[in-house]
Amino acid sequence: MASAGMQILGVVLTLLGWVNGLVSCALPMWKVTAFIGNSIVVAQVVWEGLWMSCVVQSTGQMQCKVYDSLLALPQDLQAARALCVIALLVALFGLLVYLAGAKCTTCVEEKDSKARLVLTSGIVFVISGVLTLIPVCWTAHAIIRDFYNPLVAEAQKRELGASLYLGWAASGLLLLGGGLLCCTCPSGGSQGPSHYMARYSTSAPAISRGPSEYPTKNYV
């Protein structure tokens, strides 16, 4: 049962990671700049995201603007967008692969094939986690590097936004969940069934048995 429990935990973590990744990509809070000081202009906070930027006035009023022209955007922003979308799609693909190989599904009858599919889904989730990590870390690096940006003065330093923390959490969950799914697969996929067969049955080869004939706990 421990193996099944780890699988469930792994897929729950990856699902949480995927949701976190989606929210992180969508929210315009990758870079946060506070404009507060002696001015005729109302103090404001600027949120910059992958798809839009928002200005929040101290009065509570918020204005958001979607970036219009794709070509006019900085290349690192375009790359971050692409990686975010790819990471989410890769994770979805991983989920489909997992569902095909999950214990509770009958898409694949063969035990070894099921184990391989779960292992593959784990690897795919780990890849998705790494893909999520790249734009988040790159953006964080860019914010820290902003010390040298002529546009960003001392009182207007960009800070790490909530989306980056969500992105790190998403990446961690995807890596952890994917890792758990990889760990639930024993190195010898057919070892469990053959032991069972040797001890309790000599009447039929393992390959001829149906998926529900043996206790689930013996299988990946």
Partner: antibody, heavy 117, light 107 residues
Framework: QVQLVESGGGVVQPGGSLRLSCKAS????????MNWVRQAPGKGLEWVGL????????IYNQKFKGRFTLSVDKSKSTAYLQMNSLRAEDTAVYYC??????????WGRGTLVTVSS | DIQLTQSPSSLSASVGDRVTITCSAS?????LHWFQQKPGKAPKLLVY???NLPSGVPSRFSGSGSGTDYTLTISSLQPEDFATYYC??????????FGQGTKLEIK
């Protein structure tokens, strides 16, 4: 109270050089970028460039890159616009303006530069 | 470079009139601001980020618009409002440009 005061304008011959100053007071000088904007007589406003007093970083309007140079002296809370190879069409009032949250919120009164032989 | 075109270039109106000045950009802008300039004076910030009024600017001034088309409206002209008005854009990349100006004169 935020105040910007330009100085250094005057009459200069074509091909000559001039350095304009913008003395800032009433706020943390290194906290905000400083822009330079010019206005030819009877004409509209034209953005020249900006400098970040915090790190000395500059961005220029390509039209002026090479001939105009922006600099700062943090100890004097002063921004400078060095203009070389001046032409008749550079005759204008030159303003410095503080940048606050992508907005030019405070402007100096301007200093007139006349390029004439 | 993003070009800003203001219309009209000049406008005659009377005290109490409602006046509208438009600013059209050649492509979408991130921030659009309006400035008022009186003869011999430096420009003064009038509206920032499309529709926000700095402290000290009367509420008869208002701004609106999005994308490439923006508007400055003076609901009821006062004698001190006769001046030249400029729009200015801030996009992702410089240079940041100004409109050619709209001169508001007394009729």
């Amino acid at each position: 109270q935020v105040q910007l005061v330009e100085s250094g304008g005057g009459v200069v011959q074509p091909g000559g050089s001039l350095r304009l100053s913008c003395k800032a007071s009433g706020y943390s000088f290194t906290g905000y970028t400083m822009n330079w904007v010019r206005q030819a007589p009877g004409k509209g406003l034209e953005w020249v460039g900006l400098i970040n007093p915090y790190n000395g970083g500059t961005i220029y309007n390509q039209k002026f890159k090479g001939r105009f140079t922006l600099s700062v002296d943090k100890s004097k809370s002063t921004a400078y616009l060095q203009m070389n190879s001046l032409r008749a069409e550079d005759t204008a009032v030159y303003y410095c303006a503080r940048d606050y949250g992508f907005v030019l919120d405070y402007w100096g009164r301007g200093t007139l530069v006349t390029v004439s032989s | 470079d993003i070009q800003l075109t203001q219309s009209p270039s000049s406008l005659s109106a009377s005290v109490g009139d409602r006046v509208t000045i438009t600013c059209s950009a050649s492509s979408s802008v991130s921030y659009l601001h309006w400035f008022q300039q009186k003869p011999g004076k430096a420009p003064k910030l009038l509206v920032y980020s499309t529709s926000n009024l700095p402290s000290g600017v009367p509420s008869r001034f208002s701004g609106s618009g999005s994308g490439t088309d923006y508007t400055l409206t003076i609901s009821s002209l006062q004698p001190e409002d006769f001046a030249t008005y400029y729009c200015q854009q801030r996009s992702i990349y410089p240079p940041w440009t100004f409109g050619q100006g709209t001169k508001l004169e007394i009729k």
